[in-house]
Interface confidence: low
């Protein structure tokens, strides 16, 4: 580490004095200090002498000696005060530029350490500092404004109390620049626009940045539009707004609009699409099949997508029958918006009851007229089965009626013993009826089929079972003859 002679941290001299500063190191050494007149430099290998025989207040400052060849980069310093009764301040720079939130050093160096107790920082023309200005003072370096703000970009003077009066330094201009994080922030509204030919439209492109130096423009397809710009300063940001007002839109106004803003950091752009239509429109669609089948007791959500301009003036879900005259509860209907012109309407039908099968229609209205979309809801039921013994054309017949939806299939089983349900071990015979007679088949109702099994003689100690099944489930009815002869004759006419 180099060594400075005189070996004191500070040296105080009067104007006109001779000052000699000598630095000695292991290798060659160099001096660094404030730019000031009248210094003479003598270098001799490992030593360097800085001297003046006419010190002035401008020589006030810190002089540092370094050894360029030293890998540890050691240095030594001495601070020189040239205490001029007429000049308490040596200002090293008249303009200081920093970014916001950095510390700003205003380099007014005190020429006499004795004056430190009476120093202060003021704005020019004796104005006080702005509120919340946080600063500190060092006689070697000057005043530091901590975490400088853009609003503190002002002209400052350093003040010292000499003989009861305040003596000012020349002014120092502080420029606090905003840190520009990136290209300007952009908004383009609306994000999508639809208008009928002849209507008015407005597209607003706005950009904002912490710095005033940025450009913004609006382009239609690839044409840059000439629009007057409104400027504002709000919430510590500069805003530039371009508003395109179209009194009567036509088809040539349609297309892609891009809002583009740029600054030194780069460019941002955002786009929207403007559609011009001949007349109002209202389109209803569904991603679901309009014919729905649901098992009784389960729930279903019916969804309708609406594309409309102008906006809807009314909409509702309606039950068209054929059962009760109930209407869907409004609380089961919900509306959500994808964007300005597209909406989804949902009707929730929880725990469906038999009387809720039928047609559900969604109706919507806008200036383009009414539109409706109708769903047909059929409920699925597991089969219900019953068996009776009768005579048909003189023959003993088991008659099985099965009711359900979808249409049930019918299978007859004959098994040994008396049982509620035939199991595999007991089965003696199986008959499938591929074409049972359909007794009733109305829309939204159960399908009822009938199957006949002709039995000449009912076997005692046997069970005849009719089984019906469909995609929902199965049902069965076991017929147990009470006695072999009890049902061998036709009933009385």
């Amino acid at each position: 580490i180099p060594v400075i002679e005189p070996s004191v941290p500070e040296l105080v001299v009067k104007p006109g004095a001779t000052v000699t500063l000598r630095c000695v190191g292991n290798g060659s050494v160099e001096w660094d200090g404030p730019p000031s007149p009248h210094w003479t430099l003598y270098s001799d290998g490992s030593s360097s002498i800085l001297s003046t025989n006419n010190a002035t207040f401008q020589n006030t400052g810190t002089y540092r000696c370094t050894e360029p060849g030293d890998p540890l980069g050691g240095s030594a310093a001495i601070h020189l005060y040239v205490k001029d009764p007429a000049r308490p301040w040596n200002v090293l720079a008249q303009e200081v530029v920093v970014f916001e939130d950095q510390d700003a050093l205003l380099p007014c160096l005190l020429t006499d350490p004795v004056l430190e107790a009476g120093v202060s920082l003021v704005r020019v023309r004796g104005r006080p500092l702005m509120r919340h200005t946080n600063y500190s003072f060092s006689p070697w370096h000057g005043f530091t404004i901590h975490r400088a703000k853009f609003i503190q970009s002002q002209d400052y003077q350093c003040s010292a109390l000499m003989g009861g009066r305040k003596v000012m330094s020349i002014s120092i201009r502080l420029k606090v620049q905003k840190v520009i994080p990136g290209p300007p922030a952009l908004t383009l509204v609306p994000a999508e626009l639809v208008r009928i030919r002849g209507e008015a439209a407005q597209i607003v492109c706005s950009a904002s940045s912490v710095d005033v130096n940025f450009d913004v423009f609006l382009q239609h397809n690839n044409t840059k539009l000439a629009i007057p710009q409104q400027s504002d300063f709000h919430n510590n940001r500069y805003q530039k707004v371009l508003t395109l007002n179209l009194d009567q839109v036509d088809f040539q106004h349609a297309g892609n609009y891009s809002c583009v803003a740029s600054n030194v950091q780069g460019k941002h752009s955002t786009s929207m699409f403007f559609r011009v239509v001949e007349s109002a429109y209202l389109n209803l669609s569904s991603e679901q099949n309009l014919i729905q089948e649901v098992t009784v007791g389960e729930g279903l959500n019916l969804k309708v997508m609406v594309e409309a301009y102008p906006g809807l003036q009314g909409f509702n879900w309606t039950y068209l029958g054929p059962f009760s005259d109930h209407q869907p509860e409004p609380k089961l209907a919900n509306a959500t918006t994808k964007d300005t012109y597209r909406h989804t309407f949902t009707l929730s039908l929880p725990r469906l009851k038999p009387s809720e099968a039928g047609r559900y229609s969604f109706l919507a209205r806008n200036p383009g007229g009414w539109r409706a979309l109708t769903f047909e809801l059929t409920l699925r039921y597991p089969p219900e089965v019953s068996v009776i013994w009768t005579f048909i054309n003189g023959s003993g017949t088991l008659l099985c009626a099965a009711s359900g939806y979808p249409q049930p299939n019918v299978t007859w089983l004959q098994c040994s013993g008396h049982t509620d349900r035939c199991d595999e071990a007991q089965v003696l015979q199986v008959w499938d009826d591929p074409y049972p007679e359909v007794l009733s088949q109305e829309p939204f109702h159960k399908v009822t089929v009938q199957s006949l099994l002709t039995v000449e003689t009912l076997e005692h100690n046997q069970t005849y079972e009719c089984r019906a099944h469909n995609s929902v489930g199965s049902g069965s009815w076991a017929f147990i003859p009470i006695s072999a002869g009890a049902h061998t004759h036709p009933p009385d006419e």
């Epitope: 707004v241 102008p310 609380k331 089961l332 509306a335 959500t336 909406h343």
Partner: antibody, heavy 124, light 109 residues
């Protein structure tokens, strides 16, 4: 500071007319739909009427439909409510409010900035 | 155009949590907004879109909405929170703004 200032209220006989005005400052007036809301003495808030940003669409509460007319002049940053055939039950403090219309996730509207109100008294 | 039901009054001690409800048929499918009105003053928006807060409104104010009830919650209640509170929705089918009847919040001293 965004500001809405209502004026035009006063004492009027039943069947009479009044025209309320609302002057807007410090915000982009024509970005917003606007509404009138009233509050009868000691009662709750009642929405009266709304108008879209460009005046192209208007809407009224059933209680005032056919008697009141809402309008705006964007060049003057002003909102108006023409009240005809006034009744005793129209006595209230009338507020104007900037109305934010949102079509995002859900459709909704809310009243963002309110004026201090102007008092309308209908009495014989 | 269904109405919104609010309790006429709610009382709470300072530092406690106040909950003001707003009932309505399937209100959870709509967006609910809340206003505070102090005596002699205009209403002020305190919560919009169920749970969003405008700038300048303390974090103590929060909202929720599901099913048939929306709730405005004021935590760590202060004397200055004493006011009338109104809920509001937009009825999409009529395009009308609908207010609840209002709730008077009293801060017990």
């Amino acid at each position: 500071q965004v500001q809405l200032v209502e004026s035009g209220g006063g004492l009027v006989r039943p069947g009479g007319s009044l025209r309320l005005s609302c002057a807007a400052s410090e915000f982009t007036f024509d970005d917003y739909a606007m509404s009138w809301v009233r509050q009868a003495p000691g009662k709750g808030l009642e929405w009266v009427s709304a108008i879209s940003w460009n005046g192209g669409s208007t809407n009224y509460a059933d209680s005032v439909k056919g008697r009141f007319t809402i309008s705006r002049d964007n060049a003057k940053n002003s909102l108006y409510l023409q009240m005809n055939s006034l009744r005793a039950e129209d006595t209230a403090l009338y507020y104007c409010a900037s109305t934010v219309e949102v079509a995002h996730r859900r459709l909704y509207k809310y009243l963002e900035v309110w004026g201090q109100g102007t008092l309308v008294t209908v009495s014989s | 155009q269904a109405g919104l039901t609010q309790p006429p009054s709610v009382s709470v001690a300072p530092g406690q949590t106040a909950r003001i409800t707003c009932g309505g048929n399937n209100i959870g499918s709509k967006s609910v907004h809340w206003y505070q009105q102090k005596p002699g003053q205009a209403p002020v928006l305190v919560v919009y879109g169920d749970s969003d807060r405008p700038s300048g409104i303390p974090e103590r104010f929060s909202g929720s909405n599901s099913g048939n009830t929306a709730t405005l919650t004021i935590s760590r209640v202060e004397a200055g929170d004493e006011a009338d509170y109104y809920c509001q929705v937009w009825d999409i089918s009529s395009d009308h703004v609908v207010f609840g009847g209002g709730t008077q919040l009293t801060v017990l001293q």
